[in-house]
Amino acid sequence: EPERCNFTLAESKASSHSVSIQWRILGSPCNFSLIYSSDTLGAALCPTFRIDNTTYGCNLQDLQAGTIYNFRIISLDEERTVVLQTDPLPPARFGVSKEKTTSTSLHVWWTPSSGKVTSYEVQLFDENNQKIQGVQIQESTSWNEYTFFNLTAGSKYNIAITAVSGGKRSFSVYTNGSTVPSPVKDIGISTKANSLLISWSHGSGNVERYRLMLMDKGILVHGGVVDKHATSYAFHGLTPGYLYNLTVMTEAAGLQNYRWKLVRTAPM
Protein backbone atom coordinates (compact mmCIF):
# COMPACT_ATOMS: atom_id res chain seq x y z
CA GLU A 1 0.00 0.00 0.00
CA PRO A 2 1.56 3.34 -1.03
CA GLU A 3 2.53 5.88 1.60
CA ARG A 4 1.00 9.33 1.57
CA CYS A 5 3.59 12.04 0.83
CA ASN A 6 4.38 15.23 2.64
CA PHE A 7 5.95 17.65 0.21
CA THR A 8 7.11 21.23 -0.07
CA LEU A 9 7.81 23.31 -3.17
CA ALA A 10 11.50 24.07 -3.62
CA GLU A 11 11.65 26.12 -6.81
CA SER A 12 9.60 27.04 -9.85
CA LYS A 13 10.40 29.16 -12.88
CA ALA A 14 9.02 29.82 -16.32
CA SER A 15 10.16 31.26 -19.63
CA SER A 16 8.11 31.75 -22.78
CA HIS A 17 8.14 28.09 -23.86
CA SER A 18 9.29 26.14 -20.81
CA VAL A 19 8.72 25.68 -17.10
CA SER A 20 10.76 24.06 -14.37
CA ILE A 21 9.48 22.90 -11.00
CA GLN A 22 11.29 21.29 -8.07
CA TRP A 23 9.89 19.94 -4.81
CA ARG A 24 11.09 18.12 -1.71
CA ILE A 25 9.63 15.07 -0.06
CA LEU A 26 9.60 15.37 3.72
CA GLY A 27 9.94 12.21 5.77
CA SER A 28 9.98 8.67 4.42
CA PRO A 29 9.95 7.77 0.70
CA CYS A 30 6.50 7.73 -0.84
CA ASN A 31 4.59 7.56 -4.10
CA PHE A 32 3.39 10.62 -5.97
CA SER A 33 2.43 11.94 -9.39
CA LEU A 34 3.10 15.37 -10.83
CA ILE A 35 0.29 16.36 -13.16
CA TYR A 36 0.06 19.48 -15.26
CA SER A 37 -2.82 20.97 -17.19
CA SER A 38 -4.01 24.12 -18.89
CA ASP A 39 -7.47 25.21 -19.97
CA THR A 40 -6.84 23.96 -23.51
CA LEU A 41 -4.43 21.10 -22.93
CA GLY A 42 -6.11 18.67 -20.55
CA ALA A 43 -4.17 16.81 -17.87
CA ALA A 44 -0.89 15.02 -18.45
CA LEU A 45 1.85 13.46 -16.38
CA CYS A 46 4.98 15.54 -15.94
CA PRO A 47 8.08 13.33 -16.38
CA THR A 48 9.83 13.44 -13.01
CA PHE A 49 13.55 13.14 -12.31
CA ARG A 50 15.36 12.76 -9.01
CA ILE A 51 17.84 15.49 -8.06
CA ASP A 52 18.96 14.07 -4.71
CA ASN A 53 17.56 11.86 -1.94
CA THR A 54 14.65 14.17 -1.18
CA THR A 55 14.40 16.53 -4.15
CA TYR A 56 12.58 15.89 -7.42
CA GLY A 57 12.06 17.97 -10.50
CA CYS A 58 10.25 18.24 -13.79
CA ASN A 59 11.12 20.37 -16.82
CA LEU A 60 8.64 20.91 -19.62
CA GLN A 61 9.58 22.30 -23.03
CA ASP A 62 7.60 23.37 -26.11
CA LEU A 63 4.83 24.97 -24.08
CA GLN A 64 2.54 27.72 -25.33
CA ALA A 65 3.67 31.26 -24.49
CA GLY A 66 1.54 33.38 -22.16
CA THR A 67 -0.36 30.35 -20.86
CA ILE A 68 -1.29 29.43 -17.29
CA TYR A 69 -0.32 25.88 -16.33
CA ASN A 70 -1.57 24.20 -13.19
CA PHE A 71 0.79 21.74 -11.55
CA ARG A 72 -0.55 19.30 -8.98
CA ILE A 73 1.75 17.13 -6.93
CA ILE A 74 -0.62 14.38 -5.77
CA SER A 75 -0.06 11.47 -3.44
CA LEU A 76 -3.18 9.34 -3.04
CA ASP A 77 -5.58 12.29 -2.83
CA GLU A 78 -3.24 14.68 -1.01
CA GLU A 79 -2.08 17.48 -3.28
CA ARG A 80 -0.16 20.71 -3.59
CA THR A 81 -1.00 23.02 -6.45
CA VAL A 82 1.45 25.34 -8.16
CA VAL A 83 0.28 27.75 -10.83
CA LEU A 84 2.91 28.84 -13.33
CA GLN A 85 2.50 31.09 -16.32
CA THR A 86 4.80 31.08 -19.31
CA ASP A 87 6.03 34.49 -20.46
CA PRO A 88 4.08 36.02 -23.32
CA LEU A 89 5.89 36.78 -26.57
CA PRO A 90 5.75 40.11 -28.40
CA PRO A 91 4.51 40.27 -31.99
CA ALA A 92 6.85 38.71 -34.55
CA ARG A 93 6.42 41.72 -36.85
CA PHE A 94 5.78 45.33 -35.92
CA GLY A 95 5.97 48.33 -38.18
CA VAL A 96 4.73 51.72 -39.34
CA SER A 97 2.46 52.06 -42.37
CA LYS A 98 4.23 54.73 -44.41
CA GLU A 99 1.29 55.10 -46.77
CA LYS A 100 -0.99 55.97 -43.82
CA THR A 101 1.42 58.42 -42.21
CA THR A 102 0.36 62.08 -42.14
CA SER A 103 1.78 65.28 -40.68
CA THR A 104 0.09 64.68 -37.36
CA SER A 105 -0.46 60.91 -37.20
CA LEU A 106 1.41 57.62 -37.27
CA HIS A 107 -0.26 54.31 -38.03
CA VAL A 108 1.36 51.18 -36.57
CA TRP A 109 0.52 47.52 -37.27
CA TRP A 110 1.65 44.16 -35.93
CA THR A 111 1.15 40.45 -36.43
CA PRO A 112 -0.49 38.66 -33.47
CA SER A 113 1.89 37.12 -30.95
CA SER A 114 2.15 33.36 -30.85
CA GLY A 115 0.62 31.87 -27.72
CA LYS A 116 -1.85 33.59 -25.42
CA VAL A 117 -2.14 37.36 -25.14
CA THR A 118 -4.83 39.35 -23.35
CA SER A 119 -3.72 42.80 -24.55
CA TYR A 120 -0.98 44.79 -26.23
CA GLU A 121 0.63 47.92 -24.82
CA VAL A 122 1.75 50.33 -27.52
CA GLN A 123 3.85 53.31 -26.46
CA LEU A 124 5.12 56.29 -28.44
CA PHE A 125 8.41 58.02 -27.54
CA ASP A 126 10.04 61.12 -28.98
CA GLU A 127 13.66 61.35 -30.12
CA ASN A 128 14.73 62.03 -26.54
CA ASN A 129 12.98 58.86 -25.36
CA GLN A 130 10.27 60.81 -23.57
CA LYS A 131 6.94 59.01 -23.56
CA ILE A 132 4.40 60.98 -25.56
CA GLN A 133 1.42 58.63 -25.72
CA GLY A 134 0.51 55.11 -24.66
CA VAL A 135 -2.43 52.82 -25.20
CA GLN A 136 -3.55 49.36 -24.09
CA ILE A 137 -5.38 47.41 -26.78
CA GLN A 138 -7.34 44.23 -26.05
CA GLU A 139 -6.11 41.27 -28.07
CA SER A 140 -8.09 40.73 -31.23
CA THR A 141 -7.49 38.50 -34.20
CA SER A 142 -8.96 41.08 -36.55
CA TRP A 143 -7.69 44.37 -35.19
CA ASN A 144 -3.91 44.55 -34.89
CA GLU A 145 -3.27 48.20 -35.62
CA TYR A 146 -3.39 51.60 -34.00
CA THR A 147 -3.07 55.24 -35.05
CA PHE A 148 -1.42 57.88 -32.87
CA PHE A 149 -2.90 61.35 -33.49
CA ASN A 150 -2.01 64.94 -32.48
CA LEU A 151 1.68 64.51 -33.26
CA THR A 152 4.21 67.10 -34.32
CA ALA A 153 4.87 67.31 -38.04
CA GLY A 154 8.35 66.42 -39.23
CA SER A 155 9.31 64.55 -36.07
CA LYS A 156 10.99 61.20 -35.47
CA TYR A 157 9.33 58.79 -33.05
CA ASN A 158 10.13 55.42 -31.50
CA ILE A 159 7.25 53.05 -30.91
CA ALA A 160 7.34 50.07 -28.52
CA ILE A 161 4.90 47.18 -28.32
CA THR A 162 4.59 44.78 -25.40
CA ALA A 163 2.32 41.75 -25.17
CA VAL A 164 0.45 41.24 -21.89
CA SER A 165 -0.99 37.94 -20.71
CA GLY A 166 -2.55 37.79 -17.28
CA GLY A 167 -0.07 39.39 -14.92
CA LYS A 168 2.94 38.90 -17.20
CA ARG A 169 4.48 41.11 -19.86
CA SER A 170 6.71 40.19 -22.78
CA PHE A 171 9.90 42.00 -23.60
CA SER A 172 9.23 44.99 -25.86
CA VAL A 173 9.98 45.27 -29.55
CA TYR A 174 10.56 48.59 -31.22
CA THR A 175 10.05 50.27 -34.52
CA ASN A 176 10.47 53.87 -35.58
CA GLY A 177 8.63 56.24 -37.80
CA SER A 178 8.36 59.88 -38.72
CA THR A 179 5.49 62.23 -39.32
CA VAL A 180 5.44 64.03 -42.65
CA PRO A 181 6.70 67.63 -42.38
CA SER A 182 4.14 70.38 -42.97
CA PRO A 183 4.29 72.16 -46.33
CA VAL A 184 5.10 75.87 -46.46
CA LYS A 185 2.25 78.35 -46.36
CA ASP A 186 1.56 81.52 -48.35
CA ILE A 187 4.05 81.28 -51.22
CA GLY A 188 4.74 84.81 -52.48
CA ILE A 189 6.33 85.62 -55.86
CA SER A 190 8.15 88.78 -56.88
CA THR A 191 8.81 88.57 -60.63
CA LYS A 192 11.43 90.24 -62.81
CA ALA A 193 12.42 89.48 -66.39
CA ASN A 194 15.47 87.39 -65.43
CA SER A 195 14.74 86.47 -61.81
CA LEU A 196 12.15 85.33 -59.33
CA LEU A 197 12.12 86.12 -55.60
CA ILE A 198 10.25 83.44 -53.73
CA SER A 199 8.97 83.96 -50.17
CA TRP A 200 6.96 81.75 -47.84
CA SER A 201 5.91 81.32 -44.27
CA HIS A 202 6.66 78.24 -42.16
CA GLY A 203 4.13 75.50 -41.60
CA SER A 204 3.70 73.86 -38.19
CA GLY A 205 6.15 71.40 -36.71
CA ASN A 206 9.79 70.60 -37.41
CA VAL A 207 11.74 71.42 -40.56
CA GLU A 208 15.37 70.54 -41.31
CA ARG A 209 15.71 72.36 -44.65
CA TYR A 210 13.82 73.73 -47.62
CA ARG A 211 14.57 72.59 -51.14
CA LEU A 212 13.42 74.82 -54.00
CA MET A 213 13.14 73.59 -57.57
CA LEU A 214 12.29 75.39 -60.75
CA MET A 215 11.19 73.02 -63.49
CA ASP A 216 10.63 73.45 -67.18
CA LYS A 217 8.50 70.71 -68.68
CA GLY A 218 9.58 68.29 -65.95
CA ILE A 219 13.28 69.13 -66.22
CA LEU A 220 15.06 70.81 -63.33
CA VAL A 221 16.55 74.05 -64.53
CA HIS A 222 17.34 75.70 -61.23
CA GLY A 223 17.43 74.45 -57.64
CA GLY A 224 18.65 75.41 -54.23
CA VAL A 225 18.63 74.39 -50.58
CA VAL A 226 18.20 76.74 -47.64
CA ASP A 227 18.18 76.14 -43.90
CA LYS A 228 15.12 75.81 -41.76
CA HIS A 229 15.06 79.46 -40.71
CA ALA A 230 14.96 80.87 -44.27
CA THR A 231 11.75 82.39 -45.61
CA SER A 232 12.90 83.50 -49.09
CA TYR A 233 15.01 82.45 -52.02
CA ALA A 234 15.93 84.08 -55.35
CA PHE A 235 16.35 82.41 -58.76
CA HIS A 236 18.50 84.30 -61.27
CA GLY A 237 19.40 83.89 -64.97
CA LEU A 238 15.91 83.03 -66.06
CA THR A 239 14.26 83.52 -69.46
CA PRO A 240 11.96 86.56 -69.65
CA GLY A 241 8.22 85.84 -69.98
CA TYR A 242 8.70 82.14 -69.43
CA LEU A 243 6.37 79.79 -67.50
CA TYR A 244 8.05 77.68 -64.83
CA ASN A 245 6.81 75.12 -62.32
CA LEU A 246 8.02 76.11 -58.83
CA THR A 247 8.19 73.50 -56.07
CA VAL A 248 9.00 74.40 -52.46
CA MET A 249 9.85 71.20 -50.61
CA THR A 250 9.97 70.87 -46.84
CA GLU A 251 12.34 68.16 -45.53
CA ALA A 252 12.42 66.71 -42.02
CA ALA A 253 12.93 63.34 -40.32
CA GLY A 254 13.74 61.68 -43.64
CA LEU A 255 10.40 62.67 -45.21
CA GLN A 256 9.31 65.43 -47.54
CA ASN A 257 6.26 67.54 -48.25
CA TYR A 258 5.79 70.25 -50.85
CA ARG A 259 3.71 72.99 -52.41
CA TRP A 260 3.99 73.91 -56.05
CA LYS A 261 2.95 76.87 -58.15
CA LEU A 262 3.14 77.93 -61.81
CA VAL A 263 5.15 81.16 -62.07
CA ARG A 264 6.04 83.35 -65.04
CA THR A 265 8.96 85.73 -65.30
CA ALA A 266 8.16 89.27 -66.38
CA PRO A 267 8.38 89.89 -70.13
CA MET A 268 11.17 92.08 -71.47
Partner: antibody, heavy 122, light 107 residues
Framework: EVQLVESGGGLVQPGRSLRLSCTAS????????MNWVRQAPGKGLEWVGR??????????YYAGSVKDRFTISRDDSKNIAYLQMNSLKTEDTAVYYC?????????????WGQGTLVTVSS | DIQMTQSPFSLSASVGDRVTITCKAS??????VAWYQQKPGKAPKLLIY???TRHTGVPSRFSGSGSGTDFTLTISSLQPEDFATYFC?????????FGGGTKLEIK
Protein backbone atom coordinates in the same frame (compact mmCIF):
# COMPACT_ATOMS: atom_id res chain seq x y z
CA GLU B 1 -5.74 -6.77 0.31
CA VAL B 2 -7.92 -3.90 -0.93
CA GLN B 3 -11.61 -4.66 -0.55
CA LEU B 4 -14.67 -2.58 -1.44
CA VAL B 5 -18.09 -4.02 -0.59
CA GLU B 6 -21.25 -2.28 -1.76
CA SER B 7 -24.57 -2.77 0.01
CA GLY B 8 -28.05 -1.27 0.16
CA GLY B 9 -29.24 -2.12 -3.34
CA GLY B 10 -32.64 -3.52 -4.12
CA LEU B 11 -36.02 -2.76 -5.61
CA VAL B 12 -37.39 0.75 -5.13
CA GLN B 13 -40.32 2.66 -6.58
CA PRO B 14 -39.83 5.73 -8.80
CA GLY B 15 -39.68 8.96 -6.81
CA ARG B 16 -38.44 7.19 -3.66
CA SER B 17 -34.99 7.31 -2.05
CA LEU B 18 -32.26 4.78 -1.39
CA ARG B 19 -28.87 4.92 0.29
CA LEU B 20 -25.97 2.75 -0.83
CA SER B 21 -22.94 2.05 1.34
CA CYS B 22 -19.40 1.12 0.39
CA THR B 23 -17.36 -0.47 3.16
CA ALA B 24 -13.63 -0.27 2.53
CA SER B 25 -10.70 -2.22 3.96
CA UNK B 26 -7.06 -2.98 3.19
CA UNK B 27 -5.98 0.64 2.62
CA UNK B 28 -5.89 4.04 4.32
CA UNK B 29 -9.46 5.04 3.57
CA UNK B 30 -9.20 8.64 4.76
CA UNK B 31 -6.35 9.38 2.31
CA UNK B 32 -8.22 8.30 -0.81
CA UNK B 33 -10.87 9.73 -3.07
CA MET B 34 -13.92 7.53 -3.63
CA ASN B 35 -16.16 7.29 -6.69
CA TRP B 36 -19.46 5.76 -7.65
CA VAL B 37 -19.89 4.35 -11.16
CA ARG B 38 -23.03 2.69 -12.49
CA GLN B 39 -23.92 0.35 -15.33
CA ALA B 40 -27.47 -0.06 -16.61
CA PRO B 41 -28.31 -3.64 -17.67
CA GLY B 42 -26.59 -4.41 -20.99
CA LYS B 43 -25.25 -0.87 -21.23
CA GLY B 44 -21.96 0.95 -20.76
CA LEU B 45 -20.33 2.49 -17.70
CA GLU B 46 -21.45 5.87 -16.36
CA TRP B 47 -19.44 7.80 -13.82
CA VAL B 48 -21.81 9.04 -11.11
CA GLY B 49 -19.60 11.13 -8.86
CA ARG B 50 -16.56 11.48 -6.63
CA UNK B 51 -15.79 12.58 -3.10
CA UNK B 52 -12.36 13.76 -2.08
CA UNK B 53 -10.60 13.64 1.29
CA UNK B 54 -10.84 15.86 4.35
CA UNK B 55 -7.72 17.75 3.29
CA UNK B 56 -9.65 18.60 0.11
CA UNK B 57 -12.69 19.69 2.15
CA UNK B 58 -14.63 16.57 1.15
CA UNK B 59 -15.21 18.18 -2.24
CA UNK B 60 -17.82 16.37 -4.33
CA TYR B 61 -18.35 16.21 -8.10
CA TYR B 62 -21.31 14.72 -9.96
CA ALA B 63 -22.44 13.70 -13.42
CA GLY B 64 -25.07 16.00 -14.89
CA SER B 65 -27.68 13.22 -14.93
CA VAL B 66 -27.65 12.85 -11.12
CA LYS B 67 -26.78 16.36 -9.94
CA ASP B 68 -29.23 17.70 -7.32
CA ARG B 69 -30.70 14.20 -6.80
CA PHE B 70 -27.70 12.17 -5.62
CA THR B 71 -25.32 13.03 -2.77
CA ILE B 72 -22.00 11.34 -1.99
CA SER B 73 -20.68 11.45 1.57
CA ARG B 74 -18.16 9.56 3.67
CA ASP B 75 -17.52 8.54 7.24
CA ASP B 76 -13.76 8.21 7.68
CA SER B 77 -14.14 6.78 11.20
CA LYS B 78 -16.10 3.83 9.80
CA ASN B 79 -14.30 3.53 6.43
CA ILE B 80 -17.60 3.89 4.58
CA ALA B 81 -18.60 5.94 1.52
CA TYR B 82 -22.29 6.59 0.88
CA LEU B 83 -24.43 7.34 -2.14
CA GLN B 84 -27.75 8.91 -1.19
CA MET B 85 -30.16 8.65 -4.12
CA ASN B 86 -33.34 10.76 -4.07
CA SER B 87 -36.18 11.19 -6.57
CA LEU B 88 -35.21 7.95 -8.26
CA LYS B 89 -36.20 7.36 -11.88
CA THR B 90 -36.54 4.13 -13.85
CA GLU B 91 -33.41 5.12 -15.80
CA ASP B 92 -31.41 4.97 -12.54
CA THR B 93 -31.75 1.17 -12.66
CA ALA B 94 -28.20 -0.14 -12.74
CA VAL B 95 -25.43 -1.99 -10.96
CA TYR B 96 -23.69 0.59 -8.77
CA TYR B 97 -19.95 0.17 -8.25
CA CYS B 98 -17.87 1.77 -5.53
CA UNK B 99 -14.46 2.76 -6.94
CA UNK B 100 -11.35 3.91 -5.15
CA UNK B 101 -8.90 5.94 -7.23
CA UNK B 102 -5.53 7.19 -6.18
CA UNK B 103 -2.39 8.81 -7.53
CA UNK B 104 0.69 6.72 -6.89
CA UNK B 105 4.16 6.76 -8.38
CA UNK B 106 3.35 8.52 -11.67
CA UNK B 107 0.22 6.40 -11.70
CA UNK B 108 -3.54 6.74 -11.51
CA UNK B 109 -4.97 3.52 -10.14
CA UNK B 110 -8.57 2.38 -9.62
CA UNK B 111 -9.96 -0.45 -7.50
CA TRP B 112 -13.55 -1.58 -7.98
CA GLY B 113 -16.07 -3.29 -5.76
CA GLN B 114 -18.29 -6.06 -7.14
CA GLY B 115 -21.34 -3.81 -7.35
CA THR B 116 -24.88 -3.75 -6.00
CA LEU B 117 -27.99 -3.81 -8.17
CA VAL B 118 -30.56 -1.04 -7.84
CA THR B 119 -33.88 -1.61 -9.63
CA VAL B 120 -36.26 1.34 -9.90
CA SER B 121 -39.67 0.06 -10.90
CA SER B 122 -43.29 0.46 -9.92
CA ASP C 1 -18.92 17.70 -20.44
CA ILE C 2 -16.25 15.82 -22.38
CA GLN C 3 -17.69 13.12 -24.63
CA MET C 4 -15.63 10.00 -25.23
CA THR C 5 -16.61 8.40 -28.54
CA GLN C 6 -15.41 4.83 -28.75
CA SER C 7 -15.25 2.72 -31.91
CA PRO C 8 -16.04 0.19 -33.12
CA PHE C 9 -19.15 -0.69 -31.13
CA SER C 10 -18.39 -4.38 -31.61
CA LEU C 11 -15.61 -6.38 -33.20
CA SER C 12 -15.22 -10.00 -34.27
CA ALA C 13 -11.71 -11.40 -34.27
CA SER C 14 -9.77 -14.63 -33.94
CA VAL C 15 -7.13 -15.79 -31.49
CA GLY C 16 -3.77 -14.41 -32.61
CA ASP C 17 -5.26 -11.37 -34.36
CA ARG C 18 -4.06 -7.84 -33.76
CA VAL C 19 -6.93 -5.62 -32.63
CA THR C 20 -7.21 -1.86 -32.30
CA ILE C 21 -9.92 0.06 -30.43
CA THR C 22 -10.08 3.86 -30.63
CA CYS C 23 -11.47 6.54 -28.38
CA LYS C 24 -11.97 10.17 -29.41
CA ALA C 25 -12.43 12.92 -26.84
CA SER C 26 -14.62 15.93 -27.67
CA UNK C 27 -11.93 18.22 -26.24
CA UNK C 28 -8.31 17.95 -25.16
CA UNK C 29 -7.79 15.61 -22.22
CA UNK C 30 -3.99 15.53 -22.35
CA UNK C 31 -3.05 11.94 -21.54
CA UNK C 32 -5.54 11.44 -18.70
CA VAL C 33 -7.15 8.39 -20.26
CA ALA C 34 -7.61 4.91 -18.79
CA TRP C 35 -8.69 1.66 -20.46
CA TYR C 36 -10.71 -1.09 -18.77
CA GLN C 37 -11.63 -4.67 -19.57
CA GLN C 38 -14.96 -6.04 -18.36
CA LYS C 39 -16.28 -9.57 -18.51
CA PRO C 40 -19.97 -10.46 -18.05
CA GLY C 41 -21.16 -10.22 -14.45
CA LYS C 42 -17.80 -8.85 -13.27
CA ALA C 43 -16.48 -5.43 -12.30
CA PRO C 44 -14.22 -3.66 -14.83
CA LYS C 45 -10.45 -4.23 -14.51
CA LEU C 46 -7.95 -1.44 -15.08
CA LEU C 47 -5.59 -2.16 -17.98
CA ILE C 48 -3.96 1.15 -18.92
CA TYR C 49 -3.65 4.58 -17.29
CA UNK C 50 -2.07 7.84 -18.44
CA UNK C 51 -2.98 6.69 -21.97
CA UNK C 52 -0.01 4.35 -22.30
CA THR C 53 1.09 2.92 -18.93
CA ARG C 54 0.18 -0.71 -18.29
CA HIS C 55 -1.23 -1.47 -14.86
CA THR C 56 0.62 -4.00 -12.73
CA GLY C 57 0.02 -7.56 -13.91
CA VAL C 58 -1.44 -6.58 -17.30
CA PRO C 59 0.13 -8.64 -20.13
CA SER C 60 2.47 -6.84 -22.53
CA ARG C 61 0.21 -7.62 -25.49
CA PHE C 62 -1.99 -4.74 -24.27
CA SER C 63 -0.71 -1.29 -25.19
CA GLY C 64 -2.18 2.20 -25.21
CA SER C 65 -1.22 5.31 -27.12
CA GLY C 66 -2.43 8.80 -27.93
CA SER C 67 -2.71 12.25 -26.45
CA GLY C 68 -4.96 15.26 -26.80
CA THR C 69 -8.15 13.90 -28.33
CA ASP C 70 -7.25 10.61 -30.03
CA PHE C 71 -6.46 7.42 -28.13
CA THR C 72 -5.92 3.80 -29.06
CA LEU C 73 -5.91 0.48 -27.23
CA THR C 74 -4.08 -2.28 -29.12
CA ILE C 75 -4.04 -5.99 -28.36
CA SER C 76 -1.11 -7.34 -30.36
CA SER C 77 -2.07 -11.02 -30.38
CA LEU C 78 -5.52 -11.95 -29.09
CA GLN C 79 -5.74 -14.67 -26.47
CA PRO C 80 -8.93 -16.59 -25.60
CA GLU C 81 -9.24 -14.72 -22.27
CA ASP C 82 -9.21 -11.32 -24.04
CA PHE C 83 -12.75 -11.68 -25.42
CA ALA C 84 -14.60 -9.11 -23.33
CA THR C 85 -15.90 -5.53 -23.44
CA TYR C 86 -13.42 -2.64 -23.33
CA PHE C 87 -14.05 0.88 -22.10
CA CYS C 88 -12.01 4.09 -22.19
CA UNK C 89 -12.34 6.78 -19.52
CA UNK C 90 -11.07 10.35 -19.28
CA UNK C 91 -10.08 11.66 -15.86
CA UNK C 92 -8.73 15.01 -17.04
CA UNK C 93 -11.69 17.07 -15.87
CA UNK C 94 -15.02 16.68 -14.09
CA UNK C 95 -17.30 15.03 -14.75
CA UNK C 96 -15.13 12.01 -15.55
CA UNK C 97 -16.65 10.22 -18.54
CA PHE C 98 -16.49 6.79 -20.19
CA GLY C 99 -16.64 5.71 -23.79
CA GLY C 100 -19.62 3.64 -24.87
CA GLY C 101 -17.65 0.40 -24.92
CA THR C 102 -16.39 -2.06 -27.54
CA LYS C 103 -17.52 -5.69 -27.39
CA LEU C 104 -14.78 -8.02 -28.65
CA GLU C 105 -16.25 -11.32 -29.81
CA ILE C 106 -14.82 -14.54 -31.19
CA LYS C 107 -15.12 -14.83 -34.96
Amino acid sequence: EVQLVESGGGLVQPGRSLRLSCTASGFTFNANAMNWVRQAPGKGLEWVGRIRTKSNNYATYYAGSVKDRFTISRDDSKNIAYLQMNSLKTEDTAVYYCVRDYYGSSAWITYWGQGTLVTVSS
Amino acid sequence: DIQMTQSPFSLSASVGDRVTITCKASQHVGTAVAWYQQKPGKAPKLLIYWASTRHTGVPSRFSGSGSGTDFTLTISSLQPEDFATYFCQQYSSYPFTFGGGTKLEIK
